[in-house]
Amino acid sequence: DLLNHKKFLLLPPVNFTIKATGLAQVLLHWDPNPDQEQRHVDLEYHVKINAPQEDEYDTRKTESKCVTPLHEGFAASVRTILKSSHTTLASSWVSAELKAPPGSPGTSVTNLTCTTHTVVSSHTHLRPYQVSLRCTWLVGKDAPEDTQYFLYYRFGVLTEKCQEYSRDALNRNTACWFPRTFINSKGFEQLAVHINGSSKRAAIKPFDQLFSPLAIDQVNPPRNVTVEIESNSLYIQWEKPLSAFPDHCFNYELKIYNTKNGHIQKEKLIANKFISKIDDVSTYSIQVRAAVSSPCRMPGRWGEWSQPIYVGKERKSLVEWH
């Protein structure tokens, strides 16, 4: 009935603010308009992200968290809406923004890439594994020679700053290594990486990038690959990679390369063993790699190949461990 009422006016929210609450994370907050009549009606809000990347959504709440790079600034608008089955009434927009941080674009880092690895934990008995993080980047083309870069990551609510850097010839940080982190790929949380910089000659523009832990996780190679030859058969066996994921979470790819004729046999497997027929005149190179599969998480990319094991002519009954 209200929607059909000519005089009914929807008023925009008030006190709309945007606040950076963490690396690459902002909190949008607003209040319902105190002058809004019929405040008992089921009001909603239409949020529009204008920059850095356009997005829009509806919410009943009066705050909203956004995870996005902030080095180009952030701008958003919000309006009050009232929906019915056949029409939507909307107020005017209110807008707010976070200004882009100072610095010339050419001074910020470029080509930021990050990868995570699962490694044995010597640190605490609670979990036998920990996740390391390595990030590399290129110095900005317009960055003065005295520029120094500093990297931070945020995963969930926790933020860590880098303590171990690799440097270029001018002593500028160009890579960072965290031996252990709190990163995991259990949920949908994104990894936020922030690199800021300092120089006596210019303002260095910071840079933010978001990564999916799933996409940057480098699965370890399968362990203890063993190969045995019996008559004209190759018996290949291996153990799951060093990983927090249990056995049933892995798919494997096996590569058997005939070094004599160049033929490559590839097998996709769920099991951790395989038998293959071979001739008795060729030498073979065997490698295995792994990928985490569903239902343990969304399928990830293939990990590194295990070291090649060579068997065959003049290498009968060879067993190698890696």
Epitope: T124, L126, R127, V157, Q163
Partner: antibody, heavy 117, light 106 residues
């Protein structure tokens, strides 16, 4: 692993108090540390957490701006500076070891802080 | 913030009985859940972490299970020394505890 909190005591509303926690039996700088409190006959409430080197600190909303967690890795000691105390802050305060997204695996014996006039 | 709802608030059980305590998270915590035991006048002790991993030195009659938002602690063959208050805790997004379950002997 041992965590030993300093004496608490009775403090008037609006006043300040600083708690300390001496750690031993492990490499202090290898762990995040936290303060957790428990009001009389009530449940447990996380108060604050600090990162390895003290560069990052996290607080529950009700203590933000009033409490400051800090650490001295050279002395293997954790601190909690509590300002503008109110009766709602009356509790046993525990210092606890953890490591980011981990549970609290070791706890101190706890120290009672009573805020009353 | 994630809210943890523990039930029951208190329970009485006989020696040798099996006890179950439930914990419900307000959102998925991806098994980032711990259980603690607290005896009167003592500090809490970690029993279970990552929903189902037993902490060193904890008797095997304690076990944890669950995933997503629903978790439980099971005590098989209740002993007199198990009389205590039990708390669940999530550590997926900050750190929040359930309200506790006071376990008494019948």
């Amino acid at each position: 692993v041992q965590l030993v909190e300093s004496d608490g005591g009775l403090v008037q509303p609006g006043r300040s108090l600083k708690l300390s926690c001496a750690a031993s039996g492990f490499t202090f700088s290898d762990f995040y540390m936290a303060w957790v409190r428990q009001a009389p006959t009530k449940g447990l409430e996380w108060v604050a957490t600090i990162s390895y080197d003290g560069s990052s600190a996290y607080y529950r909303d009700s203590v933000k701006g009033r409490f400051t967690i800090s650490r001295d890795n050279a002395k293997s000691t954790l601190y909690l500076q509590m300002d503008s105390l109110s009766s709602e802050d009356t509790a046993t305060y525990y210092c606890a070891r953890h490591d980011g997204y981990y549970p609290f695996d070791y706890w101190g014996q706890g120290v009672m802080v009573t805020v009353s006039s | 913030d994630i809210r943890m709802t523990q039930s029951p608030a208190s329970l009485s059980a006989s020696l040798g009985e099996t006890v179950n305590i439930e914990c419900l998270a307000s959102e998925d915590i991806y098994s980032d859940l711990a259980w603690y035991q607290q005896k009167p006048g003592k500090s809490p002790q970690l029993l279970i972490y990552d929903a189902n991993s037993l902490q060193n030195g904890v008797p095997s009659r304690f076990s944890g299970s669950g995933s997503g938002t629903q978790y439980s602690l099971k005590i098989n063959s209740l002993q007199s020394e198990d009389v205590a208050t039990y708390f669940c805790q999530q550590y997926n997004n900050y750190w929040t505890f359930g309200g506790g379950t006071k376990l008494e002997l019948k």
